[in-house]
Amino acid sequence: TVPPMVNVTRSEASEGNITVTCRASGFYPWNITLSWRQDGVSLSHDTQQWGDVLPDGNGTYQTWVATRICQGEEQRFTCYMEHSGNHSTHPVPS
């Protein structure tokens, strides 16, 4: 088992909104849970976009999940990762 590296980035979307993207890379096996939580509960699936789980060329895998949020409300969102029984949560950078 190889645990993922998780990285959260933000980019301007439209006025007053930002897109936050949570990327997991370098993990094996390929089964992974990656999702956004808002206010501590699941963010509805129709407001999240997932990338495919793809090989990254080193025998490991990578994927991502993104969502659009209101600027100034970043604290209310965390990216949740679960892989091979381990988990972590990742805030949106300021």
Epitope: T33, R37, V41, F77, E82, H87
Partner: antibody
Framework: DVQLQESGPGLVKPSQSLSLTCTVT?????????WNWIRQFPRNKLEWMGY???????NYNPSLKSRISITRDTSKNQFFLQLISVTTEDTATYYC????????????WGQGTLVTVSA | DIQMTQSPASLSASVGETVTITCRAS??????LAWYQQKQGKSPQLLVY???MLADGVPSRFSASGSGTQYSLKINSLQPEDFGSYYC?????????FGAGTKVEIK
């Protein structure tokens, strides 16, 4: 460590309002987190009532939405529960608690305060 | 709303025994589950979060598992301090709801 302490009257008459205070020490309620009220009925059933978060946004249990209000006094680091038009069914031990945004579980609770609704 | 159904409602066990408590959600909660222990006259205390993760300071005789709608809490080699009530709580969506509890009593 975050510490929470509930206070308020132990006896309320039916049709009146129930008002409770949660005093938080060890952490500013405006820094982060969701600050919650949870109650436990005499037969031990637990009910999440609602929260006010670090920015003042509230979220209530729909079963209480027409009767509940959660507010705060940031200068005193306190948040409050008001429940209007109470009945004997609102007799319960009322707890304040908080959760972090990595997940809505409750790591620490106040000691609880029993409120009896009776004429 | 997601309803949480706990079983059994109560059980009697001896010190040293292994006990298992189960919690069923009315919909898939995707491991968004916590367990609490409550002793008589005290506040609930967090035992488990994210379905399987032990909270700080929780003894390793406690373990939790599950997925989808079915979850369980297991206590190996029950100790005197483990007697009390146990509650599950989901945090998949609002409103947050709790199970009705399981009372673990001394046989």
């Amino acid at each position: 460590d975050v510490q929470l302490q509930e206070s308020g009257p132990g006896l309320v008459k039916p049709s009146q309002s129930l008002s409770l205070t949660c005093t938080v020490t060890g952490y500013s309620i405006t820094s982060d987190y969701a600050w919650n009220w949870i109650r436990q009925f005499p037969r031990n059933k637990l009910e999440w009532m609602g929260y006010i978060n670090y920015s003042g946004t509230t979220n209530y249990n729909p079963s209480l939405k027409s009767r509940i209000s959660i507010t705060r006094d940031t200068s005193k680091n306190q948040f409050f529960l008001q429940l209007i038009s109470v009945t004997t069914e609102d007799t319960a031990t009322y707890y304040c608690s908080y959760y972090r945004y990595d997940g809505a579980w409750f790591p620490y609770w106040g000691q609880g305060t029993l409120v009896t609704v009776s004429a | 709303d997601i309803q949480m159904t706990q079983s059994p409602a109560s059980l009697s066990a001896s010190v040293g025994e292994t006990v298992t408590i189960t919690c069923r959600a009315s919909g898939n909660i995707h491991n968004y589950l916590a367990w609490y222990q409550q002793k008589q006259g005290k506040s609930p205390q967090l035992l488990v979060y994210n379905a399987i993760m032990l909270a700080d300071g929780v003894p390793s005789r406690f373990s939790a598992s599950g997925s989808g709608t079915q979850y369980s809490l297991k206590i190996n080699s029950l100790q005197p301090e483990d007697f009390g009530s146990y509650y599950c709580q989901h945090f998949w969506s609002f409103p947050l709801t709790f199970g009705a509890g399981t009372k673990v009593e001394i046989k």
